[in-house]
């Protein structure tokens, strides 16, 4: 059968029908429904929501909707023994204690089961000692402290401001520096936009607001007790001492009112420069310890959280493909939230719900997609991407053979300024072409395309007249699909005009104030940005599932490979003496990129010319496109990170949220001047160049004529 026979409707009409069926009012209703009570992973409330979504997806018309459950390690505060931080005097008396909960927002005073702010997976402990302020606790912040300022964090409790990098990296850095505890806080410089009121009168963080979040360093492992395998009924679980990625020191988050009380007494060294100062009326002294009058006072942490193996539930919906049912296009986003999830995740889940409803409406009218579409409502994303990772581990053999693409659907908005897209280069042209067909929701761009407003507000730094598309990092549910399995992936959402604050999140991120009203009053009253994101995510899924030839352009991979090779070369050449001494050559990598470019170009020519009515040849060409992303996977993984297997992209070793290109070479070069054995270090650089060059060449050969 041709695609059009199978689907009963002409392709253009299909896409238009699908997009026209998406309604802002429905997304609004779904968001309201999903945000009235907390849906913390592992709780009864989140199980009930899973069953509700299962039931509604069935009503919408999906062929099947199943729950997939796993028993994974989660973390909760002790209900009778709360976590807090004290300032203690020389007699050990607590003269100041941090708050035990966030003041609830108006209308939510009587809601039960609001989990108090905590750092998920913190070990228990009651360390006490002097405080050291470590700025954002980034790698470079600890370099500044230890190397330039000669400040030793060993045996100290460090206080770090949230922002710039994933909180788990902050904790890892503090551990490596010898700290015995970590206090995380939200500084107004990062979480209070000038000229905006704090919630409930605006979208800024109030002084009592606190960001929850996990502090794991899983590196893609999923459930800490069952790395590489699903946490099913017969799973063998590691002992807690062998669990992957757990922090070894107590950690706790606080708001800026409480942070003020700790930081105002700080003594010791002055901040090294203005980049270490936030917006509180405190000196931002680094320490260690408190100033003169308060020098005998110490800080004490009281952490009593517990790690518990708990059942979680994914919802998996299937819309069977009419022509290629064994090719899967996946749309997935998480359902679990820290509290109400007004933005994270329910602004995304509401969009997925409306996309499912629209697809279901078309199916009821007799249409089917060419390829199978899988819809997923993931559980326990907030606890380390656990639901998506366990499901992918359970289904890895199917996914690696049949997975065409994965589109992520967490928060639809983190602002209302312009579109933000992170994706594989294979999807660049798909995103460009789709956004040219969609209307911009932006003020001042009436009658203009989304592509036009996006390009104007977020231009590409390299190509004029094109929008910025970023590399995929991690910190969301696409991780296992892209970084471990090599399935082409992408994500899209509306964002803020705040490039310098890219990884800090919106002010109320993971706080109790992330409510339906936050979205409805301040971010998107008409839900027009949500609708646009639904059109982008849904449109991508539609095209990936329905186009006769997969909408992947391998030439765009060639362009970025050359750019990434140039960048890593320039980093390496900053060490010319060692490059010369150890005769480090990039010939193999540049040669491989050249070959990839030529072969991709020839493949694209053949793609234009082949007989699309021949189903065997069509399937062959599509398989070459589908498997190209897979060809960048190294089965051995990256050094010390076996579940990050993509050779071109990995989450940065210094910030899980950010993507790094040629990560193996990058990490081998990082801080290489401090390595004790330069010969060994430069040998590893050469090995990583070899691995990268081989992988690029091998990937190129998958695009060559098959015989």
């Amino acid at each position: 059968k041709s695609s059009n026979e199978a689907t009963n409707i002409t392709p253009k009409h299909n896409m238009k029908a699908f997009l026209d069926e998406l309604k802002a009012e429905n997304i609004k209703k779904f968001l309201y429904n999903f945000t009235q009570i907390p849906h913390l992973a592992g709780t009864e409330q989140n199980f009930q929501l899973a069953k509700q979504i299962q039931s509604q997806w069935k009503e919408f018309g999906l062929d099947s909707v199943e729950l997939a459950h796993y028993d994974v390690l989660l973390s909760y505060p002790n209900k009778t023994h709360p976590n807090y931080i004290s300032i203690i005097n020389e007699d050990g008396n607590e003269i100041f204690n941090t708050s035990l909960f966030e003041p609830p927002p108006p209308g939510y005073e009587n809601v039960s089961d609001i989990v108090p702010p905590f750092s998920a997976f913190s070990p228990q402990g009651m360390p006490e000692g002097d405080l050291v302020y470590v700025n954002y606790a980034r790698t470079e912040d600890f370099f500044k402290l230890e190397r330039d300022m000669k400040i030793n964090c060993s045996g100290k409790i460090v206080i770090a401001r949230y922002g710039k990098v994933f909180r788990g990296n902050k904790v890892k850095n503090a551990q490596l520096a010898g700290a015995k505890g970590v206090i995380l806080y939200s500084d107004p410089a990062d979480y209070f936009a000038p000229g905006v009121k704090s919630y409930p009168d605006g979208w800024n963080l109030p002084g009592g607001g606190v960001q929850r979040g996990n502090i794991l360093n899983l590196n893609g492992a999923g459930d800490p007790l069952t790395p590489g395998y699903p946490a099913n009924e017969y799973a063998y679980r590691r002992g807690i001492a062998e669990a992957v990625g757990l922090p070894s020191i107590p950690v706790h988050p606080i708001g800026y009112y409480d942070a003020q009380k700790l930081l105002e007494k700080m003594g010791g060294s002055a901040p090294p420069d203005s980049s270490w100062r936030g917006s509180l009326k405190v000196p931002y002294n680094v320490g260690p310890g408190f100033t003169g009058n308060f020098s005998t006072q110490k800080v004490k942490m009281h952490i009593h959280s517990t790690n518990e193996v708990t059942r979680i539930y994914n919802v998996i919906g299937t819309l069977r493909g009419a022509v290629e049912p064994d090719r899967y296009v996946i749309l997935g986003g998480h359902r679990d939230s820290w509290v109400f999830g007004g933005i994270d995740p329910q602004s995304g889940a509401a969009v997925v719900h409306e996309i499912v409803r629209s697809f279901g409406t078309l199916k009821k009218e007799g249409w089917r997609p060419r390829r199978t579409i899988l819809f997923a409502s993931w559980d326990a994303e907030e606890f380390g991407l656990l639901g998506s990772t366990e499901w992918a581990e359970e289904n890895s053999r199917l996914l690696q053979e049949r997975g065409v693409a994965y589109i992520n659907a967490d928060s639809s908005i983190e602002g209302n300024y312009t579109l933000r897209v992170d994706c594989t280069p294979l999807m660049y042209s798909l995103v460009h072409n789709l956004t040219k067909e969609l209307k911009s929701p932006d003020e001042g761009f009436e009658g203009k395309s989304l592509y036009e407003s996006w390009t104007k507000k977020s231009p590409s730094p390299e190509f004029s007249g094109m929008p910025r598309i970023s590399k995929l990092g991690s910190g969301n549910d696409f991780e296992v699909f892209f970084q471990r399995l090599g399935i082409a992936s992408g994500r899209a959402r509306y964002t803020k005009n705040w490039e310098t604050n890219k990884f800090s999140g919106y002010p109320l991120y993971h706080s109790v104030y992330e409510t339906y009203e936050l979205v409805e009053k301040f971010y998107d009253p008409m839900f027009k940005y949500h609708l646009t994101v639904a059109q982008v995510r849904g449109g991508m899924v539609f095209e990936l599932a329905n186009s006769i030839v997969l909408p992947f352009d391998c030439r765009d991979y060639a362009v970025v490979l050359r750019k990434y090779a140039d960048k890593i070369y320039s980093i390496s050449m900053k060490h010319p003496q060692e490059m010369k001494t150890y005769s480090v050559s990039f010939d193999s990598l540049f040669s491989a990129v050249k070959n990839f470019t030529e072969i991709a170009s020839k493949f694209s020519e053949r793609l234009q010319d082949f007989d699309k009515s021949n189903p065997i040849v069509l399937r062959m060409m599509n398989d070459q496109l589908m498997f190209l992303e897979r060809a960048f996977i190294d089965p051995l993984g990256l050094p010390d990170r076996p579940f990050y297997r993509h050779v071109i992209y990995a989450p940065s070793s210094h910030n899980k949220y950010a993507g790094e290109s040629f990560p193996g070479i990058y990490d081998a070069l990082f801080d290489i001047e401090s390595k004790v054995d330069p010969s060994k270090a430069w040998g590893e650089v050469k090995r990583q160049i070899y691995v990268a060059a081989f992988t690029v060449q091998a990937a190129a050969e998958t695009l060559s004529e098959v015989a």
Epitope: E462, V559, R562, K563, A565, D566, K567, Y569, S570, S572, M573, P576, E578, M579, K580, T581, Y582, S583, V584, S585, F586, D587, F590, S591, V593, K594
Partner: nanobody
Framework: EVQLVESGGGLVQPGGSLRLSCTVS????????VSWVRQAPGQGLEWVSA???????YYADSVKGRFTISRDNSKNTLYLQMNSLRAEDTAVYYC??????WGQGTLVTVSS
């Protein structure tokens, strides 16, 4: 055999300009990133600038805003335009493909 041959060095006064060239052979120039590296008298090697196969440019902080790297793929030639020269720019300037392939260098002396 890979060859890189620098030219254009010489004596120039502080504040003056100079343009270095590097003609290459033995490899497909357009497909490779190339660099300028210098060595001041009695000092180690210092990376100055690189230009990628894609044309992207990279500079050491010490020369940013004063030096411009460029390439002409049709002539297999790499250039370094050096403006606002200072005494501390005095060095032998090498054209380098990577750690394995280097030119012989050309001397730049900045002195009044």
């Amino acid at each position: 055999e890979v060859q890189l041959v620098e030219s254009g060095g010489g004596l120039v006064q502080p504040g003056g300009s100079l343009r270095l060239s590097c003609t290459v052979s033995g490899f497909t120039f357009s497909s490779y990133a190339v660099s300028w590296v210098r060595q001041a008298p009695g000092q180690g090697l210092e990376w100055v600038s690189a230009i990628g196969a894609g044309g992207g440019t990279y500079y050491a902080d010490s020369v940013k805003g004063r030096f411009t790297i460029s390439r002409d793929n049709s002539k297999n030639t790499l250039y370094l335009q050096m403006n606002s020269l200072r005494a501390e720019d005095t060095a032998v300037y090498y054209c380098a493909k990577d750690g394995a392939d280097w030119g012989q260098g050309t001397l730049v002396t900045v002195s009044s």
